[in-house]
Interface confidence: medium
């Protein structure tokens, strides 16, 4: 669709005569009839196939025609067409004399014709005017013409329809050739696709308007590049949505069970070494001079009764000191200046001379010990507690305080490592001397049967065209994240061209 425009500029009829040579009375009141038709090698009469237009009386005899387009007038003359411009045309311009006010063809005598010109040729669509001048014996006509496209039509033939829009069907203006020029923030064939926030993740994010980044289920963050862990996940992370992969030192379904009690709680006191031994379980190895489960008790060096022969022990900063009774000397009062004659054996002990009476030895009755039978037998001296248990004297009896992981009267029994059900996926647990062993069911391996060796159901690759597949657990099936240019639940359909323009 377009318009053939004809601009009449000047008509010269100096003698004021008709084509017949007869003069007009009082002068030639001139108007024009224009006929536009398809190209003819020889322009002949017949239907004006491209259109026809007439002017009012524009002047008498010779006159210049005013450009009246700005004032809404009829110069240039408009010959609209509703078809593809063929690029060629034929044009007939007739100048007529109007004796009266009725300009209809049937109201005029045939000899009222002043002049008739006919041209034909090629004419491309464009903004530039073609200037032409046609001269006959008695008249001269100067004019120019061009073909331009109607509003919203573009291209070499005015055949391309393009109407700028900014709505659901597109966001664009039209280029001179009729191609779409997307408004800022929009892209795609019809500028219907918003350009998301720069950096918005291609698969995990999307947008409904420019510079937006909306996250698909399971993703978060400004650019939708952070996965959301399973709800309730405490000390864990994810690499794909809804995971809860525990941080080091944490375990359990929601990574809320402390497996590294030593680091998180520092229970061992006085510089002791801490060792994790299971969930919320630990062992403290005390530095010399300390005891207790957490090495919280200071151990007196006199507690081991180092002074012999009734010597009394005094704690000192750098150790201890023995105060020996009369007749004894040495670091531990181990040397005697006594003999059997001095009755050195206490608690009914028998004295035996040695080295020709230079020293002696006491034979002690039951329940007494020491070089002079001065000490009651300490039931803990034989260290009856196994596995590092602590022996405690309780009057006539004794008891063992066991380290974590051991039990029994003498801490001789291992607490079963299998009691915690450490084998995953129905694995069978076997207690060993130094730990445990899991026998895994088919489809699982690893120290705790934690490694799944069965086929991942996602390996069936339900998504086409290199789409990313993951399961959105809030729906009933897997979700395919389609790359640009594909749609469908499995991304199986390429985005097709619409069958016609969407307006």
């Amino acid at each position: 669709s377009g318009v053939f425009q004809l601009q009449l500029q000047e008509f010269i009829n100096e003698r004021g005569v008709l084509a017949s040579g007869r003069p007009c009375e009082p002068g030639c009141r001139t108007f024009f009839r224009v006929c536009l038709k398809h190209f003819q090698a020889v322009v002949s009469p017949g239907p004006c196939t491209f259109g026809t237009v007439s002017t009012p009386v524009l002047g008498t005899n010779s006159f210049a025609v005013r450009d009246d387009s700005s004032g809404g007038g009829r110069n240039p003359l408009q010959l609209p067409f509703n078809f593809t411009w063929p690029g060629t045309f034929s044009l007939i311009i007739e100048a007529w004399h109007a004796p009266g006010d009725d300009l209809r063809p049937e109201a005029l005598p045939p000899d009222a014709l002043i002049s008739k010109i006919a041209i034909q040729g090629s004419l491309a669509v464009g903004q530039n005017w073609l200037l032409d001048e046609q001269t006959s014996t008695l008249t001269r006509l100067r004019y120019s013409y061009r073909v331009i496209c109607s509003d919203n039509y573009y291209g070499d033939n005015c055949s391309r329809l393009c109407k700028k829009r900014n709505d659901h069907f597109g966001h664009y203006v039209c280029q001179p050739d009729g191609n779409l020029s997307c408004l800022p923030g929009w892209t795609g064939e019809y500028c219907q696709q918003p350009i998301c926030l720069s950096g918005c993740h291609e698969q995990n994010g999307y947008c409904s308007k420019p510079a937006e980044c909306l996250c698909r289920p399971g993703w978060q963050g400004r650019l939708c590049n952070e996965c959301i862990p399973h709800n309730g996940c405490r000390h864990g992370t994810c690499s794909t949505p809804w995971q809860c992969t525990c941080d080091e030192g944490w375990g359990g379904l929601f990574c809320d069970q402390d497996l590294n009690y030593c680091t998180h709680h520092s229970p061992c006191k006085n510089g002791a070494t801490c060792s994790n031994s299971g969930q919320r379980s630990y062992t403290c190895t005390c530095r010399p001079g300390y005891t207790g489960v957490d090495c919280e008790l200071e151990l007196s060096e006199c507690d081991s009764n180092p002074c012999r022969n009734g010597g009394s022990c005094k704690d000192q900063e750098d150790g201890y000191h023995c105060l020996c009774p009369p007749g004894y000397y040495g670091l531990h009062c181990e040397h005697s200046t006594l003999s059997c004659a001095d009755s050195p054996c206490f608690n009914g002990g028998s004295c035996r001379e040695r080295n020709q009476g230079a020293n002696y030895a006491c034979e002690c009755p039951p329940n007494f010990t020491g070089s002079n039978c001065e000490k009651k037998v300490d039931r803990c001296t034989s260290n009856p507690c196994a596995n590092g248990g602590q022996c405690l004297n309780r009057g006539p009896s004794r008891m063992c305080r066991c380290r974590p992981g051991f039990t029994g009267t003498y801490c001789e029994l291992h607490v079963s490592d299998c009691a915690r059900n450490p084998c995953a996926h129905g694995g069978t647990c076997h207690d060993l001397e130094n730990g445990l062993m899991c026998t895994c069911p088919a489809g699982f391996s690893g120290r705790r049967c934690e490694v799944r060796t069965s086929i991942d159901a996602c390996a069936s690759s339900p998504c086409f065209n290199r789409a990313t597949c993951y399961t959105d657990l809030s729906t009933d099936t897997f979700v395919c994240n389609c790359p640009y240019g594909f749609v469908g639940s499995r991304c199986e359909f390429p985005v097709g061209l619409p069958p016609s323009f969407p307006w």
Epitope: G218, I228, H230, N231, G232, R234, P241, W242, C244, C246, G251, G252, L253, F254, D256, Q257, A424, H425, F444, E450, R452, D456, A457, C458, Y470, T471, L473, S474, D476, T477, F478
Partner: antibody
Amino acid sequence: EVQLVESGGSLVQPGGSLRLSCAASGFTFSNGWMTWLRQAPGKGLEWVATIKPDGSDTAYVESVKGRFTISRDNAKNLLYLQMDSLRGDDTAVYFCARDLAYNAFDIWGQGTMVTVSS
Amino acid sequence: QSVLTQPPSASGTPGQRVTISCSGSSSNIGSNTVNWYQQLPGTAPKLLIYSNNQRPSGVPDRFSGSKSGTSASLAISGLQSEDEADYYCAAWDGSLNGYVFGTGTKLTVL
């Protein structure tokens, strides 16, 4: 069609064992956290155990710890509950369910009845 | 024994609005999301509300959930006869390391 179907429930004597199965279809089983729940006759709902998608971690209600074991076979789309040392108070309808990412159970089986009685 | 407390029963006439409360503690409702289930007589429970106030597809918008502090509530507007069922609230409990249910509320449509 998305569905879970439990099987294996029966009458068992106290101290006995039973293994329940739950067959999943219509969704990607290997991606789902799975759970067993139960409901004693005329009583409310009780959570029993949950297992992560890869089976790496499990959690149990205190009353069944050491007696029940939840496991799964992703290749066969099956969830299991091995129940040992059964007691009278374990009598209930046992449901398997899929755990949404929000600790919410969106797909439930029809349930299977377990009766512990001498 | 249930950790979350619900009223044992509730009732209303068709078209009315009914609210069911659920009271817990800081270790469950206070620090985790709340879910609601509907159990029609003789059937398996059905998820009604998850993550405090989200409705799964297929659940009418007559059902809505909310949470404040250590309490939650389920509201049913435009009550219908088919809403007659048992309703349970539930949440993960960080102290017990387990999923806890409410005592259940029996809703009667008069």
